[in-house]
Amino acid sequence: SQPQAVPPYASENQTCRDQEKEYYEPQHRICCSRCPPGTYVSAKCSRIRDTVCATCAENSYNEHWNYLTICQLCRPCDPVMGLEEIAPCTSKRKTQCRCQPGMFCAAWALECTHCELLSDCPPGTEAELKDEVGKGNNHCVPCKAGHFQNTSSPSARCQPHTRCENQGLVEAAPGTAQSDTTCKNPLEPLPPEMSGTMLM
């Protein structure tokens, strides 16, 4: 089998065998090595010498195989835009950000750039569970049968109605999507002023 050419090598068709780790240098019409993540080009290649790479300085990074002559500056997540950090910048990776708790991504440009407060779900509903937290605003869905939710909240979950018999009590008023079951002592009549409370 033919030995594999090692960069730098001539390329007549302007393409290189390994697109990820090599690039075409048009001035010399050769394929040269890219620099690995965490490094940058400190000396460009020539016909007789391959690319020379150097490590990114502190506080800078390059994420991919590249032929950049500089590293990108690390930037913090912007708390004013509702973002928080989940992982620090390294020489091979930019700072990883996500929306702060209770917020969702409202503006996306390759990554999230702006988060806004999740809207409240009204009583009788709850936020539909999403695969990824912070990806979109709340979509409120009604509590399923036998459950209730009595607040306006972005995060409150529907709870099962109290089963009076489990507490040795009897039902005074059935639960609704917005209120729990009202229970009473089986020996006591229900006072007329009582609504939405539990007598023990």
Partner: antibody
């Protein structure tokens, strides 16, 4: 060269607060994260949180949220860590450290003793 | 939180011995692991970052390896000044976490 110089030892009563300082020199204070790490006697290291002095934003380990406050004064290149509602388990050496792929630079440590 | 499990917790060795300390992460942390040496009453000193990058001024007898979840610090030939406690740390995601430490004692 990078230097982090911390304030002196403190003895505090349970329930009180302590504020430890960390003065940075030898680099641009506003462009690097400063972290706080503590070490109880004979124990391992525990990360508490960081501040980015450029925008004075801080993030904390959930374990300490509500009890720890990290601040920074850009004019003096000094970071501060305040821990409130102290208990005996908070007796430890508190370190500030500048981060980049770990903690290449550390302060000398500040011993905080909580005792009634 | 990511747990960093270091072993052994202590070991006895002689000058000239080859010493290996391991650290296991509870989930993949790539190569985002650092190693520190600490002597009594002193702040930790950085030895290794990015799992295998040795800081300038750190003797070549110290080397690090590993990626993903399994990491190793090796001292190829133990010197008298190496008797200390060693910690690993992951800086892949917050909260940063440390191993519980390995105390290297004189046999």
């Amino acid at each position: 060269q990078v230097q982090l110089v911390q304030s002196g030892a403190e003895v505090k009563k349970p329930g009180s607060s302590v504020k430890v300082s960390c003065k940075a020199s030898g680099y641009t204070f506003t462009t690097y994260y400063l972290h706080w790490v503590r070490q109880a006697p004979g124990q391992g290291l525990e990360w508490m949180g960081w501040i980015y002095p450029g925008n004075v934003h801080a993030q904390y380990n959930e374990k300490f949220k509500g009890r720890v406050t990290i601040t920074a004064d850009k004019s003096t290149s000094t970071a501060y860590m305040e821990l409130s509602s102290l208990r005996s388990e908070d007796t430890a050496v508190y370190y500030c450290a500048r981060s980049w792929e770990g903690f290449p630079y550390w302060g000398q440590g500040t011993t905080v003793t909580v005792s009634s | 939180d990511i747990q960093m499990t270091q072993s052994p917790s202590s070991l006895s060795a002689s000058v000239g011995d080859r010493v290996t300390i391991t650290c296991k992460a509870s989930q993949n942390v790539g190569i985002n692991v650092a190693w520190y040496q600490q002597k009594p009453g002193k702040a930790p000193k950085s030895l290794i970052s990015s799992a295998s990058y040795r800081y300038s001024g750190v003797p070549s007898r110290f080397s690090g390896s590993g990626s993903g979840t399994d990491f190793t610090l090796t001292i190829s030939s133990l010197q008298p000044e190496d008797f200390a406690t060693y910690f690993c740390q992951q800086y892949d995601t917050y909260p940063f976490t440390f191993g519980q430490g390995t105390k290297v004692e004189i046999k």
